[in-house]
């Protein structure tokens, strides 16, 4: 059995040239005729040179999975799905996303170091000593309040709470 070159496919004991992306095999090669190809019908595609008798069905972006259509399917490219705003891709296969997760909300004591994108979760970072954050979408930790000369410090600030001052 012959081993075919790259971008050829085996038919019986003959190697036939593959069809171009966006096409599928209509008629395999023969003595005088190369591979006869046909364009992929709507909602189907082939992304690479291929020996397929049928094009592949285009993917569908499922809103219940947090997905939206970012790029429509073409005859040579599958649908590209992206996560809806506020979500990021949990399962990425090349440029294809199958499931999305909601962006992490930073807990109290942390700030948003890097905002979440369609393919990356939010990155949180601890507040430095002397600052605090209530968490959520806060990008900066706030400095503790300095009690004035006429006030008394009742409770020292933590990374999640401000200093508590009381009037004398």
């Amino acid at each position: 059995q012959p081993s075919c070159r790259q971008e050829e496919f085996l038919v019986g004991d003959e190697c036939c040239p593959m069809c171009n992306p966006g096409y599928h095999v209509k008629q395999v090669c023969s003595e005088h005729t190369g591979t006869v190809c046909a364009p992929c019908p709507p909602q189907t595609y082939t992304a690479h040179a291929n020996g397929l008798s049928k094009c592949l069905p285009c993917g569908v972006c499922d809103p219940d999975m947090g997905l939206l259509t970012w790029q429509e399917c073409s005859s040579w490219k599958d649908t590209v799905c992206r996560c809806i705003p506020g979500y990021f891709c949990e399962n990425q296969d090349g440029s294809h996303c199958s499931t999305c997760l909601q962006h992490t909300t930073c807990p109290p004591g942390q700030r948003v170091e890097k905002r979440g994108t369609h393919d990356q979760d939010t990155v949180c970072a601890d507040c430095l000593t002397g600052t605090f954050s209530l968490g959520g979408t806060q990008e900066e930790c706030l400095p503790w309040t300095n009690c004035s000369a006429f006030q008394q410090e009742v409770r020292r600030g933590t990374n999640s709470t401000d200093t508590t001052c009381s009037s004398q």
Partner: antibody, heavy 118, light 108 residues
């Protein structure tokens, strides 16, 4: 003698239309697929379109898709190319080609010149 | 689409010399390649099909070889009428049919 003879070329303005014909003689026209191939002045050969012998399968180059229409009348041994929305870059000699060695092109017409210019 | 690249662009030789023209495909076209000759003001003429089969009526000083991605047209001894432009064309996977950009064989 096996022969293909093109006609219908000429000067046309951008956006205009033209219909080319290719008359076949000396062979059983209805048995063969036929191609249109063009050649811009001083340039190489470019495949334009192909129609199968019964006329049921038609293919076009991306550069002409949606603007050109190939057809054939087997009773008249004639091939046609309807060219609409013509552009300056469509200026070329247009050849029809066919032959026994399909899809190799062993019979060619003498060509007809299409000039798209304002 | 499959791109065919011909080399050299121009070949300057004398009558009686051997001419070797190359055609390279961007991916395999098997054995499905033709060579055409075109003289100024004339339609192309089929010389070789199936990479190596000589078209009827073509002198046997013309020969073709190769398969896959690399093909060669050889003219064993150039005659004065052989000075012309030569094109390769693939039909390994179509549509589209594609042609090389041509090699001009000129008198040195």
């Amino acid at each position: 003698e096996v022969q293909l003879l093109e006609s219908g070329g000429g000067l046309v303005q951008p956006g205009g239309s033209l219909r080319l014909s290719c008359a076949a003689s000396g062979f059983t026209f209805s048995n063969y697929a036929i191609h249109w191939v063009r050649q811009a002045p001083g340039k190489g050969l470019e495949w334009v379109s192909t129609i199968s012998s019964p006329g049921s399968t038609i293919n076009y180059a991306d550069s002409v898709k949606g603007r050109f229409t190939i057809s054939r009348d087997n009773s008249k041994n004639t091939l046609y190319l309807q060219m609409n929305s013509l552009r300056a870059e469509d200026t070329a000699v247009y050849y029809c080609a066919s032959g026994y060695l399909y899809p190799a092109m062993d019979v060619w017409g003498q060509g007809t010149l299409v000039t798209v210019s304002s | 689409e499959i791109v065919l690249t011909q080399s050299p662009g121009t070949l300057s030789l004398s009558p009686g010399e051997r001419a070797t023209l190359s055609c390279r495909a961007s991916r395999s076209v098997g054995k499905y390649l033709s060579w055409y000759q075109q003289k100024p003001g004339q339609a192309p003429r089929l010389l070789i099909y199936g990479a190596s089969k000589l078209q009827s009526g073509i002198p046997d000083r013309f020969s073709g070889s190769g398969s896959g991605t690399d093909f060669t047209l050889t003219i064993s001894r150039l005659e004065p009428e052989d000075f012309a432009v030569y094109y390769c064309q693939q039909y390994g996977s179509w549509p589209p049919f594609t042609f090389g950009q041509g090699t001009k064989v000129e008198i040195k």
